[in-house]
Amino acid sequence: GELETSDVVTVVLGQDAKLPCFYRGDSGEQVGQVAWARVDAGEGAQELALLHSKYGLHVSPAYEGRVEQPPPPRNPLDGSVLLRNAVQADEGEYECRVSTFPAGSFQARLRLRVLVPPLPSLNPGPALEEGQGLTLAASCTAEGSPAPSVTWDTEVKGTTSSRSFKHSRSAAVTSEFHLVPSRSMNGQPLTCVVSHPGLLQDQRITHILHVSFLAEASVRGLEDQNLWHIGREGAMLKCLSEGQPPPSYNWTRLDGPLPSGVRVDGDTLGFPPLTTEHSGIYVCHVSNEFSSRDSQVTVDVLDPQEDSGKQVDLVSAS
């Protein structure tokens, strides 16, 4: 006869490990007892259990409550046992010693591998600002046994670097993602992907990128100067900019206070029916936590009568 076992038994932390030991004997052969021991404990073998054909399973005090026989139906030639709720410390070498009649004794050895799935964590780097050089966007750490694989999934252009720390029974892997911040990256997902044999599927943690910036400011509304004449209603100036975080707007007049009746509504400056009082230099001040920008325009309110007189003069002058 011969013993059938596995070279390696792999389980995930917390699962039950079946340690196989089956005697494939000739007809009439019997298994008297099967002794299971851990054999890499350093100070000699450590008994797990003794499986006796007459007296059943006797679990060693060191493994009390943790070793069972597989559920029925049971073959009398099967010396396999279940190690319940495998922990990392169970990883190691085990052997079964089988005493048979009349063929004598047999032994087999196997390695129990306990996979410890990682619990990844993602830590964003310092605040990203446009104009910075290569900057840490995020780091992702995962510890497990064996060492997990940590990669990044993103459309953003960047560079990655990884380092690994080995502990007694596990390894921690940290991967960093560096990039040169630009406003186009805003709102883009940066996903840490952790792979491990103890996971049914990859674990993914997504971080949304936020890059602080403030665009140049410009003012719209003066494209057609002829519309800015006395009496015109609904005239307005709009300050154009964009930023992250979203900017706030402030309007001032360079050559004095804002005329009465002029309404400030965020990025928009609304005028009452125009008078010559509204002529002047207006400044839009845009700011966020990152920066501030100014844009100024000159409003020149035209008097239609003066304009027509001038035109006549111009005509007569010609």
Partner: antibody, heavy 120, light 111 residues
């Protein structure tokens, strides 16, 4: 310090029973099997059996299956061996013994021995 | 049951010389990991004392003049150099299977 303190010598009549005790101290009582070994005068050693202090489960040498009963009292960290239907063949020194590490093999710690004399 | 046969039954050795005791098992007690054979010393009126475990591993506190070797079915206990206090009976014991058994013993005396 691991100590196994056995009860004193016993003189018993043939056909009677005797119960030997082995008080354990200095270690986790439930973490190790307690073994019992017989040594007849001028003879070698014979392994009688072992008991698991966690649950009282015992394994015997078939030769002693009907002779010895192994029990434990967890509260007093004491192991007992009762010998029944005694004959002169049972006159011997009986030892309790413990393994070096939880579940490992060999007997690193021994009681001082209890002499049982069976005589009419 | 596994039978352990020790030889010689008794042995007289001069101080400082080597004492060699053999133990033969009726079947192999060795795996790829360990040999499940142990050696004990017993002095009159005392319990046995573990000297060597797993064929060759010296038990803590045991003098280095004691050594064990062997595998499979043949095992040896060596004492060198022998000292006066080594006068005792020596036993081998296997823990391959239940029942554990002991050899018949070897009585060591000084010449």
């Amino acid at each position: 310090e691991v100590q196994l303190q056995q009860s004193g010598p016993d003189l018993v009549k043939p056909g009677a029973s005797v119960k030997i005790s082995c008080k354990a101290s200095g270690y986790s009582f439930t973490g190790h099997y307690m073994h019992w070994v017989k040594q007849s005068h001028g003879k070698s050693l014979e392994w009688i059996g072992r008991v698991n202090p966690n649950n009282g489960g015992s394994s015997y040498n078939q030769k002693f299956k009907d002779k010895a009963i192994l029990t434990v009292d967890k509260s007093s960290t004491t192991a007992y061996m009762e010998l029944r239907s005694l004959t002169s063949e049972d006159s011997a020194v009986y030892y309790c013994a413990r393994d070096p590490l939880g579940g490992s093999y060999g007997f690193a710690y021994w009681g001082q021995g209890t002499l049982v004399t069976v005589s009419a | 049951d596994i039978v352990l046969t020790q030889s010689p039954a008794s042995l007289a050795v001069s101080l400082g010389q080597r004492a060699t005791i053999s133990c033969r098992a009726s079947q192999s007690v060795t795996t790829s990991s360990y040999s499940y054979m142990h050696w004990y010393q017993q002095k009159p009126g005392q319990p046995p004392k573990l000297l060597i475990k797993y064929a060759s591993n010296l038990e803590s506190g045991v003098p280095a003049r004691f050594s064990g070797s062997g595998s499979g079915t043949d095992f040896t206990l060596n004492i060198h150099p022998v000292e006066e206090e080594d006068t005792a009976t020596y036993y081998c014991q296997h823990s391959w299977e239940i029942p554990y058994t002991f050899g018949g013993g070897t009585k060591l005396e000084m010449k």
